[in-house]
């Protein structure tokens, strides 16, 4: 079942999932100057069964040079002051993630993809938070959020994380401190 809303926003922090539950949607968004192809799906879907899951549909972007006539453009919004949702990443996944039943890996980038990924998560999904570069994590508890179903409604648990303005960045669970990785993003991950 789809979560009604997005994971909580934590000031100066971003979140990501280590793996995506079956039923998760990833919107097909294109970078500025490109649009989703006319016959292209609205989103990719994590689909499959307990033994094997994969992303259904392929996102495809095409040049919007003819924008004045077609007016079919899938944009990268102009002002993204701070990334609040999962950003596009190269498929740097933990080796054992494929064995997580009913889950999909981070999908590989598609050509001319927008820099920000918009996911629609399902109940039971867990996301992990880290402070953006230049901020340090003060943990009061787990820096994670889970979409739960309560009394027929979905809600995300509140991550216990505060990001304070110091130079140190925090990592996702089980990660080494990144070395010269862009935006403090780690080079490897482990599964949740």
């Amino acid at each position: 079942e789809l979560c009604d809303d997005d994971p909580p926003e934590i000031p100066h922090a971003t979140f990501k999932a280590m793996a995506y539950k079956e039923g998760t949607m990833l919107n097909c968004e294109c970078k500025r100057g490109f649009r989703r192809i006319k016959s292209g799906s609205l989103y990719m879907l994590c689909t499959g069964n307990s033994s094997h899951s994969s992303w259904d549909n392929q996102c495809q972007c095409t040049s919007s040079a003819t924008r004045n006539t077609t007016k079919q453009v899938t944009p990268q919004p102009e002002e993204q002051k701070e990334r609040k949702t999962t950003e596009m990443q190269s498929p740097m996944q933990p080796v054992d993630q494929a064995s997580l039943p009913g889950h999909c890996r981070e999908p590989p980038p598609w050509e001319n993809e927008a820099t920000e990924r918009i996911y629609h998560f399902v109940v039971g999904q867990m996301v992990y938070y880290q402070c953006v570069q230049g901020y340090r994590a003060l943990h009061r508890g787990p820096a994670e959020s889970v979409c739960k179903m309560t009394h027929g409604k979905t809600r995300w648990t509140q991550p216990q994380l505060i990001c304070t303005g110091e130079m140190e960045t925090s990592q996702f669970p089980g990660e080494e401190k990144p070395q010269a990785s862009p935006e403090g993003r780690p080079e490897s991950e482990t599964s949740c």
């Epitope: 789809l2 009604d4 809303d5 997005d6 039923g23 949607m25 919107n27 500025r32 649009r35 006319k38 016959s39 292209g40 799906s41 609205l42 989103y43 879907l45 689909t47 259904d56 549909n57 007016k71 079919q72 453009v73 899938t74 944009p75 990268q76 919004p77 102009e78 002002e79 609040k84 949702t85 920000e116 918009i118 629609h120």
Partner: antibody, heavy 114, light 107 residues
Amino acid sequence: QIQLQQSGAELVRPGTSVKMSCKAAGYTFTNYWIGWVKQRPGHGLEWIGDIHPGGSYTNYNENFKGKATFTADTSSSTTYMQLSSLTSEDSAIYFCTSRNFAKWGQGTPVTVSS
Amino acid sequence: DIVLTQSQKFMSTSVGDRVSVTCKASQNVGTNVAWYQQKPGQSPKALIYSASYRYSGVPDRFTGSGSGTDFTLTISNVQSEDLAEYFCQQYNSYPYTFGGGTKLEIK
């Protein structure tokens, strides 16, 4: 709680135009496309088009090009649809929808009558 | 444009019964189909996405199935509150289109 709140009913004259609004709350407005759908009794649901508030980019159904115009105001998280050169065929309920059609507004009834 | 045909405009059923609403696409749309329920005087409510996935809060007596061109919304153990019109929709390609609707009547 995610909500799409639409403006109230409109009674307008043929040949004029009307502008209705759809105010979003409870999610990041600039992340998601807002679509517009027309419903007339006996005609089912028709997709008019959509707009991405983050860049005010639009898609229009060919049947509504020149009829509908979408705009967005990110400061108030509101999307607008203007319908021009109104005729009786435009009398309908107009819905806004977002988050891949998961969420719908309550609808704005438009009556075109002289 | 892709045409979605809901051949049965009206369906009559009884409380506790099982009913299937069908939707046929004029061309292959994969599983890019959604189902909506609309009660009189209300806006459509999303029930199913990607042909078979339920939205949160939708009772599990509603199930969607199908791919390609043929799709079905099945309501098992029909309840009186299921009295409504049901629409299918494709979002495989622009322009997105809807079926004509099937009105469910409770005997």
